[in-house]
């Protein structure tokens, strides 16, 4: 058993999360989690749901009770999400910490931002897409 | 020529982001995508700028001089990181917008925590990886 | 200040026996992976072996795999190497290392490093 | 496996600028951080730089390290040589499956 599993127990304790009545109303991630079985759109998603983890758990970073659990848990998410790669969960990390109102932040975000564009797609490094590919599908 | 780009050039304009100063101090954003040539990678990486950008743009959503620059170049975004599909950009829009001090979605979060790292890494769906592929590296 | 002392080392025959210790000094011990890396008399670095804060993970070099044993004991901030069936290309210089940051199951950088302790096989 | 290739020697004069390289033979360089480390006869090794071009506290601004994808090399810079500079220098990194490489060494000789 992964070590993560016995610390998130602790944690459903911790958080009163263990109950029934807590998945009234559905579900926040895995729902969406199902909806989606693309590796490169399965990243998509779970990019988010693991930074709203990170976020969640530095909320409570002082709170010496859980501290132990938090840290195994964000311990196997550097494994298994960011395949043990430093670089990687530095570089998500950076991107995470960039505060919207800063305006020498903005100012770099919209100087950067046809760059950016231009690399979105996957279609990027092969050739142009036509321009029918562009409709919004439902 | 695709329509961001006379958009975009509009948003430097209003946001004063076309002198070379604005690269001072390195790069946001595009820095780290050269560091990764990964699709799934270059997708964690992605998903954390698009999200920074939609934010950004919600932030100036009552300023009408740059409106129809801001909706081209999010439709554009939806074309070519959603692949024009609105399914996913409406589940990525819910997972942007839980708010992590809400005690219920807290509680949602820690209860569904397990099942979340359970289908983290790629290897998930083909079976359980063996521990001695679980190291931290550099 | 951070210390790592190794020891252990000495003449074996091919096919012996050792066992290498390093006491750590200075930091949280358990926080940190800890690695052994090995320099062959006038050669370059080689990693060995690495092992997680916990000592719930450990990872080998092909070259010692099945038959070097990597291990910690955290109450008595020490690290071990016990090494089987030596052979004369194991002889060397082996360092201890513990990982340059906390938090992550084993050492992506290796800071600082123990004295060293020679390790001969040889007949 | 990649390899990490360094150049076997180098030799600068003192108040000179040398460089090192060292190139990963498959794979991406910038994909996961390299380390650089001084070892002086008869000592331990000791980090000059980390996580690309990061230096540890203590480490002479002299020192810098820098990653060029182009030629998948990093390079370890030192200016203003110093007769103490004289040492073996590693470059090392992750390498994808759970080891650690590292570079054959470079010689830096200074004259």
């Known amino acids: 058993q992964d070590p993560y599993v016995k610390e998130a127990e602790n944690l459903k304790k911790y958080f009163n999360a263990g109950h029934s009545d807590v998945a009234d109303n559905g579900t926040l991630f895995l729902g969406i989690l199902k909806n989606w079985k693309e590796e490169s759109d399965r990243k998509i998603m779970q990019s988010q749901i693991v930074s709203f983890y990170f976020k969640l758990f530095k909320n409570f970073k002082d709170d010496q009770s859980i501290q132990k659990s938090v840290e195994t848990i964000k311990e196997d998410m550097n494994v298994k999400f960011f395949n043990s790669n430093k670089k990687k969960r530095d570089d998500f990390e950076k991107l995470t910490n960039y505060s919207v109102t800063d305006l020498n932040v903005q100012r770099k975000a919209i100087h950067e931002l046809i760059q950016v564009m231009a690399e979105l797609s996957p279609a990027a490094k092969t050739g142009k897409r036509k321009r029918s590919q562009m409709l919004f599908r439902g | 020529q695709d329509p961001y780009v006379k958009e975009a050039e509009n948003l430097k304009k209003y946001f004063n982001a076309g002198h070379s100063d604005v690269a001072d101090n390195g790069t946001l954003f595009l820095g780290i995508l050269k560091n990764w040539k990964e699709e799934s990678d270059r997708k964690i990486m992605q998903s954390q700028i698009v999200s920074f950008y939609f934010k950004l743009f919600k932030n100036f959503k009552d300023d009408q001089s740059i409106q129809k620059s801001v909706e081209t170049i999010k439709e554009d975004m939806n074309v070519k990181f959603f692949n024009s599909n609105k399914k996913k950009r409406d589940d990525f829009e819910k997972l942007t917008n839980y708010s992590v001090t809400d005690l219920n979605v807290q509680r949602k979060a820690i209860h569904e925590l397990i099942q979340v790292m359970a289908e983290l890494s790629p290897a998930a769906k083909t079976g359980k990886r063996k521990r001695s592929q679980m190291l931290f590296r550099g | 200040e951070v210390q790592l002392l190794e020891s252990g080392g000495g003449l074996v025959q091919p096919g012996g026996s050792l066992r290498l210790s390093c006491a750590a000094s200075?930091?949280?011990?358990?926080?940190?992976?800890m690695s052994w890396v090995r320099q062959a008399p006038g050669k370059g670095l080689e990693w060995v072996s690495a092992?997680?804060?916990?000592?719930?993970?450990?990872y080998y070099a092909d070259s010692v795999k099945g038959r070097f044993t990597i291990s910690r004991d955290n109450s008595k901030n020490t690290l071990y190497l016990q090494m089987n069936s030596l052979r004369a290309e194991d002889t060397a210089v082996y360092y201890c290392?513990?990982?340059?940051?906390?938090?992550?199951?084993?050492?992506?950088?290796?800071?600082?490093w123990g004295r060293g302790t020679l390790v001969t096989v040889s007949s | 496996n990649f390899m990490l290739t360094q150049p076997h020697s180098v030799s600068e004069s003192p108040g000179k600028t040398v460089t090192i390289s060292c190139t990963r033979s498959?794979?991406?360089?910038?994909?996961?951080?390299v380390q650089w480390y001084q070892q002086r006869p008869g000592s331990a090794p000791t980090t000059v730089i980390y996580e690309d071009n990061r230096r540890p506290s203590g480490v002479p601004d002299r020192f810098s390290g820098s990653i060029d994808s182009s030629s998948n090399t990093a390079s370890l810079t030192i200016s203003g040589l110093e007769a103490e500079d004289e040492a073996d220098y590693y470059c090392q990194s992750y390498d994808g499956s759970n080891r650690w490489m590292f570079g054959g060494g470079t010689k830096l000789t200074v004259l």
């Open positions: 290392a513990k990982d340059g940051s906390s938090g992550w199951y084993v050492p992506h950088w290796f800071d600082p």
């Open positions: 200075g930091f949280t011990f358990s926080s940190y992976a």
């Open positions: 498959s794979g991406s360089i910038v994909s996961n951080y």
């Open positions: 092992i997680s804060g916990s000592g719930g993970s450990t």
